[in-house]
């Protein structure tokens, strides 16, 4: 399992992971105590047939070519959590691991 | 976690799981001994903002709106394996659980 890594200077048109820092402060999300920003990354690019396909299923659907199937798209295939400190709806401070906050790898699915 | 289920008569335009039977025999994939066909399903439909979003990350990327991020797409969010009997490249018969062969749920990511 592997995926491409790109940056803002890359000329890669295929599905790739790009750096992105999410800034909660800039969003006005004041209920998040920490972190105020974190490296989230995101996926972007084209999914040509077979390139970076995560699942055999993606290839099979392409073969079967059913009505309305749009072909694979560039999406996170591996994600990881981050620890966060935040206020919940009852104004209690919660410290917890929030799943799927960071994109570690991108692929076509 | 939930996802929509549709069929060929559905008028649903949003991200939905549709039935699809994959027929290995029709593909000429004769190295697969069994099953000769199975119910794979596939995802299709539109991903309006927030609808069926699997990860908070998807929402955050939409907020941050980086260059080239195409918005979420309708993709498998839950998959399951099937048991298969097949020949490997060394012409040995292998019996094993092949992951991510069936789409159980679709969502926007």
């Amino acid at each position: 399992d592997f995926g491409l890594d790109c940056d803002e200077h890359s000329t890669e048109s295929r599905c790739c992971r790009y750096p992105l820092t999410v800034d909660f402060e800039a969003f006005g999300w004041d209920w998040i105590i920490a972190p105020k920003r974190y490296k989230a990354n995101y996926c972007s690019g084209e999914c040509e047939f077979v390139f970076l396909q995560k699942y055999p299923h993606t290839h099979l659907v392409h073969q079967a070519n059913p009505r309305g199937s749009a072909g694979p798209c560039c999406t996170p295939t591996k994600m990881s959590p981050i620890n966060m400190l935040y206020f919940n709806g009852k104004e209690q401070i919660i410290y917890g691991k929030i799943p799927a906050m960071v994109v570690d790898r991108c692929g076509c699915s | 976690d939930f996802g929509l289920d549709c069929d060929e008569h559905s008028t649903e335009s949003r991200c939905c799981r549709y039935p699809l039977t994959v027929d290995f025999e029709a593909f000429g994939w004769d190295w697969i001994i069994a099953p000769k066909r199975y119910k794979a399903n596939y995802c299709s439909g539109e991903c309006e903002f927030v609808f069926l979003q699997k990860y908070p990350h998807t929402h955050l990327v939409h907020q941050a709106n980086p260059r080239g991020s195409a918005g979420p797409c309708c993709t498998p969010t839950k998959m399951s394996p099937i048991n298969m009997l097949y020949f490997n490249g060394k012409e040995q018969i292998i019996y094993g659980k092949i992951p991510a062969m069936v789409v159980d749920r679709c969502g926007c990511s």
Partner: antibody, heavy 124, light 107 residues
Framework: QVQLVQSGAEVKKPGASVKVSCKAS????????MHWVRQAPGQGLEWMGN????????NYNQRFKARVTMTTDTSTSTAYMELRSLRSDDTAVYYC?????????????????WGQGTLVTVSS | DIQMTQSPSSLSASVGDRVTITCKAS??????LSWFQQKPGKAPKSLIY???RLVDGVPSKFSGSGSGTDYTLTISSLQPEDFATYYC?????????FGQGTKLEIK
């Protein structure tokens, strides 16, 4: 529908070879194991071996291994069973049979279709 | 090799009777047992697979049961067309082995 049509009866001398054919129709020939089973006059059934036409991988009963060869011609969807060094006790009806998988386990199958049989008589 | 012992080797019965044929394996065959019917001059015909599953198109008067080493074929109400020879087959391991057959005759 699935059909297995075998070649006609043969009379052979001891020490000779015989090649029995089994022509398949009504299904994708390359994707199903073909087995060979024989039956001596008034006797029971005896498994000889099988072949997978897609890649020619075969599995023989040890009892026949030195004398039998199973082959296929995918262009004509035909399976062949050749038995060499014939003896009088090889006089039998030889059947081909298709193995059909109802599940995915290695033994999740049964014989769903049989050829009509080919009588091979070995006599001096 | 796994030995399959079928009994009885022959059986006389009347139309309408219920008959049972047994097959004993020399070791556990994990229910990988099939039953066949064979009429004179004809190829065998599959009746039952995986010990108790009926092949499509086979009448429900045929039933199979058993596990481990002991298996039975039951014909609930004999009709004239059921008089034939019946064989069991184990497919749990190679080489495949058949029982020696049970000849079912009209009394």
């Amino acid at each position: 529908q699935v059909q297995l049509v075998q070649s006609g009866a043969e009379v052979k001398k001891p020490g000779a070879s015989v090649k029995v054919s089994c022509k398949a129709s009504g299904y994708s020939f390359t994707g199903y194991f073909m087995h060979w089973v024989r039956q001596a006059p008034g006797q029971g059934l005896e498994w000889m071996g099988n072949i997978y036409p897609y890649n020619g991988v075969s599995n023989y009963n040890q009892r026949f291994k030195a004398r039998v060869t199973m082959t296929t011609d995918t262009s004509t969807s035909t399976a062949y069973m050749e038995l060499r060094s014939l003896r009088s006790d090889d006089t039998a009806v030889y059947y081909c049979a298709r193995r059909y998988y109802y599940g995915t386990g290695p033994a999740d199958w049964y014989f769903d279709n049989w050829g009509q049989g080919t009588l091979v008589t070995v006599s001096s | 090799d796994i030995q399959m012992t079928q009994s009885p080797s022959s059986l006389s019965a009347s139309v309408g009777d219920r008959v049972t044929i047994t097959c004993k394996a020399s070791q556990d065959i994990n229910s990988y047992l099939s039953w066949f019917q064979q009429k004179p001059g004809k190829a065998p015909k599959s009746l039952i697979y995986r010990a108790n599953r009926l092949v499509d198109g086979v009448p429900s008067k045929f039933s199979g049961s058993g596990s481990g080493t002991d298996y039975t074929l039951t014909i609930s109400s004999l009709q004239p067309e059921d008089f034939a020879t019946y064989y069991c087959l184990q497919s749990d391991e190679f080489p495949l082995t058949f029982g020696q057959g049970t000849k079912l005759e009209i009394k």
